[in-house]
């Protein structure tokens, strides 16, 4: 159907809250400098147009695309110049390219602020003085800081948000009740980030076939009753959908997935049997139930794969005659077949059955050629599963904070380069693969483990890309999507590292590392084991094990002394000269 | 190159029934979604019925639910539509359509005329 009014359109679709909701993310996903107050009158003064052309489809200007009207929106910004810099350039162009200017320009590391969430009888106040206004900051703040956020998802956290707060602002202890809520959902918020940074990087540096791929794997596991068909046009559709979020056409995308969410509704029959709590679910709780939906039996009586992929005369014909739809159907064959495989490794397997083909058909006798492809498989396969199985035992020995210190060396080793925040951040989250899947059934952990530590390999690879220090990180992150993980493991010392100069004030600390909560605590440790190794790279695990023990001895010490402030500056500098002579 | 070659076409009084079937060559059949599609005088294309590769789901749309049943025979290449309880509105040309992907089909026969009248 042709609209005379895209903007009218998405409004009639959408309805009106959540297309105020999507403009604000969009505005600011795109100026993450602007105040709040900015972008609430911007989205107002959008959604009010897109009001008025619904309303009037023929009225001025409202059949104009949604980048012009955005882009327009955005140049119309004062600040521009001052706050952005070139961003503002992008002004000058015309569209397409104005829009590609601005997404060139966001930022994946803003370096705002953790937020910081004031008294809960301030922020009852607050939530019950203007609840619109209160949800809006949310997203805008979330928005902000996570340029990549999948929008419609966010659309669905502020309602969970809206959800915390109308329950725990009538509870008695207003503060128990927030504190484990709100801490649940930021840690959901953060795995949702970096999941869509993930699927948009993805699709941006390795294109559509890289999407779909993983797509096919990821859903034939979760919908092993449905047949390739139904997979394929899930797949598109989805692809569509983050394509359309990644590239900032935010009110597209939200739109499509919920389409997507109908059509699976729809189709539930010939997709999966777990679908039907999801799909008497409002849309926005319909879309995130789908996405997380739990996976579907297996049917029970699966051929074997041998039967069509190796015995069968004509695998070659078969691949020459439709190479992707054949690759595709043994990505999904296999994938539906095991569910306790991770999609990168999925994704291997298909790789090295596609590179066999290509060899084998090109030989006399192809059928003796590939014969053996399934059993050398194996170990593509005992590769992930002896690395999840090897760093679980390490975690269950040191806990979370030692497990994150180990890979704080081990990274930090393997690319001494690249900044130090960086370093901490990246180890930091890799170390929570611990506590996130080694606690999970054998059956779950492989899956679990590589699939997040891709995710985060890629935040890596993504601050890596703003400022390229290594050129093994470089080549980690750009060669393979799929073997990301495997390059990085077998990333030994960089040898080439020309050691860093000793500086005093980065190992001087002072009395308000007290103060600090836990988590902030164990950053600052976790810095100086950074900068220490960058200054000593050749340090033994023994070496740095007792000088990060002096270290918390230090801390604890002064921070129970009467005078903390001249304890750690007259204990501080002796620690450093000890732990230099310890590392000589 | 993909052929789907369709037969068991032709007039049939209501209430009457018709087997229609399609051979289908070159392309790997069993990994297929297969299906009948038609085309009533003066109307558009319309999905009757599904089936998948391996023929453990069908679909029908509702105007010819328990009157057609679908069926395949991997190992013969070739796809079948039992029509039962025939009426005047099921006249139409029936095509036989290889699907790659639900709801869309990449190649279709060149159709079998389905005529019912008294």
């Known amino acids: 159907e042709a609209y005379k009014s895209e903007i009218a359109h998405r409004y009639n679709d959408l309805g009106e809250e959540h297309f105020r909701g999507l403009v604000l993310v969009a505005f600011s996903q795109y100026l993450q400098q602007c105040p709040f107050e900015d972008h609430v009158k911007l989205a107002k003064e959008v959604t009010e147009f897109a009001k008025a052309c619904a309303a009037e489809e023929s009225g001025a200007n409202c059949d104009k695309s949604l980048h012009t009207l955005f882009g327009d929106k955005l140049c119309t910004v004062a600040s521009l110049r001052d706050k952005y810099g070139d961003m503002a350039d992008c002004c000058e162009k015309q569209e397409p390219d104005r829009n590609e200017c601005f997404l060139a320009h966001k930022d994946d590391n803003p370096g705002f602020p953790p937020l910081v969430a004031p008294e809960p009888d301030a922020l009852c106040a607050a939530f019950q003085d203007n609840e619109q206004l209160f949800l809006g900051k949310y997203l805008y703040e979330i928005a902000r800081r996570h340029p990549y956020f999948y929008a419609p998802e966010l659309l669905y956290y502020a309602q969970q948000y809206k959800g915390v707060f109308a329950e725990c602002c009538q509870a008695a202890d207003k503060a128990a009740c927030l504190g484990p809520k709100i801490e649940a959902l930021r840690e959901k918020v953060l795995l949702s980030s970096a999941k869509e940074r993930f699927k948009c990087a993805s699709l941006q540096k390795f294109g559509d076939r890289a999407f779909k791929a993983w797509s096919v794997a990821r859903l034939s596991q979760r919908f092993p009753k449905a047949d390739f068909a139904e997979i394929s046009k899930v797949v598109t559709d989805l692809t569509k959908v983050h394509k359309e979020c990644c590239h900032g056409d935010l009110l597209e995308c939200a739109d499509d997935r919920a389409d997507l969410a109908k059509y699976m509704c729809e189709n539930q029959d010939s997709i999966s049997t777990k679908l039907k709590e999801c799909c008497d679910k409002p849309v926005l709780e319909k879309s995130q139930c789908l996405a997380e939906v739990e996976r579907d039996e297996l049917p029970g009586d699966l051929p074997s794969l041998a039967a069509d992929f190796v015995e069968d005369k004509e695998v070659c014909k078969n691949y020459q005659e439709a190479k992707d739809v054949f690759l595709g159907t043994f990505l999904y064959e296999y994938a539906r077949r095991h569910p306790e495989y991770s999609v990168s490794l999925l994704l291997r397997l298909a790789k090295e059955y596609e590179a066999t083909l290509e060899k084998c058909c090109a030989t006399d006798d192809p059928p003796t050629c590939y014969a053996k492809v399934l059993d050398e498989f194996k170990p593509l396969v005992d590769e992930p599963q002896n690395l999840v199985k090897t760093n679980c035992e390490l975690f269950e020995k040191l806990g979370e904070y030692g497990f994150q210190n180990a890979l704080l060396v081990r990274y930090t080793k393997k690319a001494p380069q690249v900044s130090t925040p960086t370093l901490v951040e990246v180890s930091r989250k890799l170390g929570k693969v611990g506590t996130k899947c080694c606690k999970k059934p054998e059956s779950e952990r492989m899956s679990c483990a590589e699939d997040f530590l891709s995710v985060v390999l890629n935040r890596l690879c993504v601050l890596h890309e703003k400022t390229p220090v290594s050129e093994r990180v470089t080549k980690c992150c750009s060669e393979s999507l799929v073997n990301r993980r495997p390059c990085f493991s077998g990333l030994e010392v960089d040898e080439t590292y020309v050691p860093k100069e000793f500086n005093a004030e980065t190992f001087t600390f002072h009395a308000d590392l007290c103060t600090l909560p836990e988590a902030e605590k164990q950053v600052k440790k976790q810095t100086a084991l950074v900068e220490l190794l960058k200054h000593k790279p050749k340090a033994t695990d023994e070496q740095l094990k007792t000088v990060m023990g002096d270290f918390g001895a230090f801390v604890e010490k002064c921070c129970a002394a009467e005078n903390k402030e001249g304890c750690f500056s007259e204990e501080g500098p002796k620690l450093v000269a000890a732990a230099q002579a310890a590392l000589v | 190159e993909v052929q789907l070659l369709e037969s068991g076409g032709g007039l049939v009084q209501p209430g009457g029934s018709l087997r229609l079937s399609c051979t289908a060559s070159?392309?790997?059949?069993?990994?297929?979604?297969m299906g009948w599609v038609r085309q009533a005088p003066g109307k558009g294309l319309e999905w009757v019925s599904w089936?998948?590769?391996?023929?453990?789901?069908?679909y029908y749309a509702d105007s010819v639910k328990g009157r057609f049943t679908i069926s395949r025979d991997n190992s013969k290449n070739t796809l079948y539509l039992q029509m039962n309880s025939l009426r005047a509105e099921d006249t139409a040309v029936y095509y036989c359509?290889?699907?790659?992907?639900?709801?869309?089909?990449?190649?279709w026969g060149q159709g079998t005329l389905v005529t019912v009248s008294s």
């Open positions: 070159g392309f790997t059949f069993r990994h297929y979604r």
């Open positions: 359509a290889k699907s790659y992907m639900a709801g869309t089909f990449d190649y």
């Open positions: 089936i998948r590769p391996d023929g453990t789901f069908t």
